[in-house]
Interface confidence: medium
Amino acid sequence: DIIMRPSCAPGWFYHKSNCYGYFRKLRNWSDAELECQSYGNGAHLASILSLKEASTIAEYISGYQRSQPIWIGLHDPQKRQQWQWIDGAMYLYRSWSGKSMGGNKHCAEMSSNNNFLTWSSNECNKRQHFLCKYRP
């Protein structure tokens, strides 16, 4: 049997059963999540669940830029350091940069400091690039 690889929306890229859209426009975390949802297909801000997934995403983004952080779908909605993925994925893989998690920083970004392989927490109202994800 021929197994066809699912296709992603134009401008999105495919990796291991998921489609990813990298958006180089400035949105705060909640607006970024709303915009991801607006693209349909059950899209949300991206969950990153393995080093392999992180590496693939990082390589793609580095082709565009290496200096600006990018919102992902990890947040701390209760503001109690109880982080969760907005798409409901299990919070098992972790890649925090080791910086302080204190203050009013309850949304996660891929940090440009380590080629987008590690995460930092930031204030959710900051306007940054963002990464969406859905399963086709």
């Epitope: 180089r24 426009k25 400035l26 705060n28 709303l34 565009y64 830029q65 600006q68 109202n125």
Partner: antibody
């Protein structure tokens, strides 16, 4: 359809203040950021600042920091730009422009001419 | 961060013109580029957003592209018409702040 209706022309003396408005219709007001851009006579476009209509938080171009204030009135679906300590070189058309999902800045107001002259 | 455009370009009806927009530092691909058309006495209108997307109502004679090797964006207008005569501005963002090019006057000969 989306419309941004701006207030009428203003003539001010140097040192005075001006407050102009941008009334939005045709969409959910608090969903989209509003930018302000100005254009001096015969010159190019210059970004002034941006406001989040959900909560008065605003950012300004460095040259306008401390002299421009962006505010909003949700019930009136209106965003305001106030500029203090006006100078003759502030004479310009001031435009508001709306960000959108996907498309950025597709919707613009028609502009408000502010003339600063003694 | 600055965006540099040629002061003016010209072309004959039916021909193709390209307007460039070069970034002064960093990568032009770091943030999306928009293009605005402004006819005399009118407000700007968006002809290209997010590098190469056209708002509805903008003819497909208008196209946008990014060239990372020259760190520049381009607006190409094919099948020139007299109504295309206008000023064209590129725009991008530098983290929180928005930046415009100086504008290019397109003359249709």
């Amino acid at each position: 359809q989306v419309q941004l209706v701006q207030s009428g022309a203003e003539v001010k003396k140097p040192g005075a203040s001006v407050k102009i408005s941008c009334k939005a219709s045709g969409y959910t007001f608090n969903r989209y950021y509003i930018h302000w851009v100005r254009q001096a006579p015969g010159q190019g476009l210059e970004w002034v600042g941006i406001i989040n209509p959900r909560g008065d938080s605003a950012n300004y171009a460095q040259k306008f920091q401390g002299r421009v204030t962006l505010t909003r009135d949700t019930s009136a679906r209106t965003v305001y730009m106030e500029m203090n300590s006006l100078r003759p070189d502030d004479t310009a058309v001031y435009y508001c422009a709306r960000e959108g999902v996907g498309a950025t800045w597709v919707h613009w107001g028609k502009g408000t001419l502010v003339t600063v002259s003694s | 961060f600055m965006l540099t455009q040629p002061h003016s370009v010209s072309g004959s009806p039916g021909k193709t013109v390209t307007i460039s927009c070069t970034g002064s530092s960093g990568s032009i691909a770091s943030n999306y580029v928009q293009w605005y058309q402004q006819r005399p006495g009118s407000a700007p209108t968006t002809v290209i957003y997010e590098d190469n997307q056209r708002p509805s109502g903008v003819p497909d004679r208008f196209s946008g592209s990014i060239d990372r090797s020259s760190n520049s964006a381009s607006l190409t207008i094919s099948g020139l018409k007299t109504e295309d005569e206008a000023d064209y501005y590129c725009q991008s963002s530098d983290t929180m702040f928005q930046v415009f090019g100086g504008g290019t006057k397109l003359t249709v000969l």
